[in-house]
Each structure stands twice: as C-alpha cells, then as structure tokens.
Interface confidence: low
C-alpha cells in the first residue's frame, strides 16, 4: 500500500530513508538536458522474496540532443499523486541489509540522473530526520517518522525534532521560510522496534548517512 502523502516536514531539517521497504518505487528522473530512453522504465521497484530484496528495472537517461523531439516529461503513474523528494546524498553507504529483511539498499546512481530522487513510499517505511547545515537539534537521539495505516488511511507519525540556528540565543528560527513540519514527542505508535547495529550521533548521520537503522524506545 502506497503512503498517501509525504513524510512530515520539519523547519530547517531534511529526511532520509536508510533502507526502502519492498514495494517502494523510485522515479526514473534525468537531469536537465537528458531524458529517459524511449523504452526505459518509468520507475525502479523494490521487490524481493523472504531472503533477498533488490530493485527491479534500471533507470536509463540519454541526451535530449540526440532526438529532434520535444523534451519528454516523465509521466507519473495515476495513483502516485504525491511525490516524496529526497536530495541525493553522496557519498552514500547503504545500510546493512542483513539487519533489515524485506528492504532494499539505496539504489546505486545511474548515469545522468536528476539531482533529486523522488520516492513513493509504502506503509511501514521509516525515514530519519536531521537538521540542515547551520542548525542543531534541540532533542536527544533519533527523530524518525513511520508511514502507518490507521482506519484504512495512511499517515506518517510525528518526528521529534526542533532545529535551531547554532548562533541564535534569544530568537527561535523561523523568519526565513523553513524547508520543512510538526515536531513533538513521538506518538505512542512510533515505537517501532527495528533491529540495530550502531547508532552514531545525529551529526554524524548528517555527515555521511552511514548510520545503521536503530532501535527506538518510545519515550
């Protein structure tokens, strides 16, 4: 089941998935001046069996200049109204899949891909938040959001994160347009236990996104 909307936004923060649940789709988007090859996939799909998950299809981009036709716009499958956008992180170390059956690693880059990746998440997906450069977190530990199905509707749980400017002492940030929404104590349903290897501090996560998925205690 696809999640109906985007993960919540948080002022001055970005989110990132460490691994992608089976059923997740990634749009095959090309950078400016390039387009999907005519017979190419619209999206990559995380599929798998009980022991192994991987991305089906391969995105391929080709130079727009090689054809005299108008630029091709990637059509969206009809049911995918909402677009989940994450900026490319590079270099990227995928999470250890041994600890997360039923999940795909971050797909490897393809030639001439767009600078942003647009994912279509499924129920059960967890994403992790970090403050953008120049801001620090006013909370301890991870901030995550999980796409859950409640009463037949999908929704993302609320991450616990407030990001404040490092130099600010008396004024709370917010005068400039935030990049991203709500914060607070995670709701009880966010106590989603996922096996963990090692959780560094969030600033390290922001630097390399190499952190493994971690167990979260509902506080």
């Amino acid at each position: 089941e696809l999640c109906d909307d985007d993960p919540p936004e948080i002022p001055h923060a970005t989110f990132k998935a460490m691994a992608y649940k089976e059923g997740t789709m990634l749009n095959c988007e090309c950078k400016r001046g390039f387009r999907r090859i005519k017979s190419g996939s619209l999206y990559m799909l995380c599929t798998g069996n009980s022991s192994h998950s991987s991305w089906d299809n391969q995105c391929q981009c080709t130079s727009s200049a090689t054809r005299n036709t108008t630029k091709q716009v990637t059509p969206q499958p009809e049911e995918q109204k909402e677009r989940k956008t994450t900026e490319m992180q590079s270099p990227m170390q995928p999470v250890d899949q041994a600890s997360l059956p039923g999940h795909c690693r971050e797909p490897p880059p393809w030639e001439n891909e767009a600078t942003e990746r647009i994912y279509h998440f499924v129920v059960g997906q967890m994403v992790y938040y970090q403050c953008v450069q120049g801001y620090r977190a006013l909370h301890r530990g991870p901030a995550e959001s999980v796409c859950k199905m409640t009463h037949g509707k999908t929704r993302w749980t609320q991450p616990q994160l407030i990001c404040t400017g490092e130099m600010e002492t008396s004024q709370f940030p917010g005068e400039e347009k935030p990049q991203a929404s709500p914060e607070g104590r995670p709701e009880s349903e966010t106590s989603c236990l996922v096996t963990t290897t090692d959780f560094q501090i969030q600033t390290e996560m922001a630097a390399t996104m190499e952190t493994s998925i971690f167990t979260t205690e509902y506080q």
Partner: antibody, heavy 116, light 107 residues
C-alpha cells in the same frame, strides 16, 4: 501513561516571586523539549517559555523576558518556571507541555493570581 | 510576532452539521499550524498538526487544510462531544502564537 502535574500556583502580590513545578512521568523526560503555556481567565493561550531537552537552550516571549526563568531537573523529571517581578497581567492558568511547539501532552494547569 | 486571527469567534451549529473554523496569519506560516480543542475546565488537546495531520486518537471527522496565511479546521459531522473552544497555533516563528479561539456550541 504520560502525566504532567503542575504545582506551586496561588495568590501572590505584584512584584513578588513564585516558582511553578511540573512533575513528569510516563516518558523519558530528559529526551524531550518542554514548554510553559498560559491562559488568562476567559482569554486565549500564549506560549511563555521553552527549554531544550538538555536545558542549554531557552526561549521566552518578550513580555516575560528577564523576569521568568524556565529550567529543568532531568534527574528528577521536573520542569520549573521561576517567575519574578510578577505583574497583574501574569494572572493566568499555567500549563506545562511536552514537545516544544506541538504541545502534544499537557498538564491540568495551575492557577497563578497576581493581586494586591 | 505573527498574529493569528480566528473566525468566527462564536459558532452555533446542530448535531450532524458540517462546521468550518478559519484561521488567518498576519504572515505566511508555511503550513506549520496546529489545531487544539479545549473543553470547559480542561487543558487543550491537539487535534491536528502540520495543517492536516490528524493526531492519534482524534476522530476522523476532524480535518485541517490550508496554506500560506489561510487555514481551516473542518468537523464533517458535528457531535455533542465536540462542544468546545478551538484554537489554531502557528509554529513557523518564535514566539509561537495562538488564535483567539472559536467557541462552538450546539443549537
């Protein structure tokens, strides 16, 4: 079950001080930002002060800046609001709340009356 | 500070009615908006966060929408237990600020 229980309210004369406490249970207090919100009788709500999980960052509304001090004791899972130089316009029910801007959990509130 | 103006300040409606409450910011609040319900003698409780996300445990008859400076709380079918005062609150800029409230009563 999350519980926030405020105490320390009552009647106080203008210019005097009062300290409110909020005892928290049901979640790991030291991991979460906290705030005080107040509501004057028959009036709206206003955010008074905010404190980060570790107490390093505090924010105040302008009208209380320099008079009120928010603090916390993570070992005791208690939030405080020290109110000095109290004014009649500080008369209100004071609520402690979790989660910074979200106000997800609230205490039952404690009444502070500033009057001579 | 960002001023949040709610309308109407008082609302009377019948059980089963669709009710809408409006909230307007003095400047763009970027969808960083919560809605609270406060019953007489009780602390507020949050219904909606981030403009349109329903708080866990809140009935689905409550919904939120809006963007920029204009936001709406909708109760799709009013129930007797919905009698309360409703507040919006922005959190895009400190100090976070509430609207003046909308008192909802039954006809």
């Amino acid at each position: 079950e999350v519980q926030l229980v405020e105490s320390g309210g009552g009647l106080v004369q203008p210019g005097r001080s009062m300290k409110l406490s909020c005892a928290v249970s049901g979640f790991t207090f030291s991991n979460h930002a906290m705030a005080w919100v107040r509501q004057a009788p028959k009036k709206g709500l206003e955010w008074v002060a905010y404190i980060s999980y570790d107490g390093d960052n505090t924010y105040y509304r302008d009208s209380v800046k320099g008079r009120f001090t928010i603090s916390r004791d993570n070992a005791q899972s208690t939030l405080y609001l020290q109110m000095d130089s109290l004014r009649s316009e500080d008369t209100a029910t004071y609520y402690c709340t979790t989660g910074g801007n979200s106000g997800y959990d609230w205490g039952q509130g404690v009444m502070v009356t500033v009057s001579s | 500070d960002i001023q949040m103006t709610q309308s109407p300040s008082f609302l009377s409606a019948s059980v089963g009615d669709r009710v809408t409450i409006n909230c307007k910011g003095s400047q763009n609040v970027n969808k960083f908006l919560n809605w609270y319900q406060q019953k007489l003698g009780e602390a507020p409780r949050r219904l909606i966060y981030g403009t349109n996300s329903l708080q866990t445990g809140i009935p689905s008859r409550f919904s939120g929408s809006g963007s920029g400076t204009d936001y709406t709380l909708t109760i799709s079918s009013l129930q007797p237990e919905d009698v309360a005062t409703y507040f919006c609150q922005q959190y895009t800029s400190w100090p976070w600020t509430f609207g003046g409230g909308t008192k909802l009563e039954l006809k």
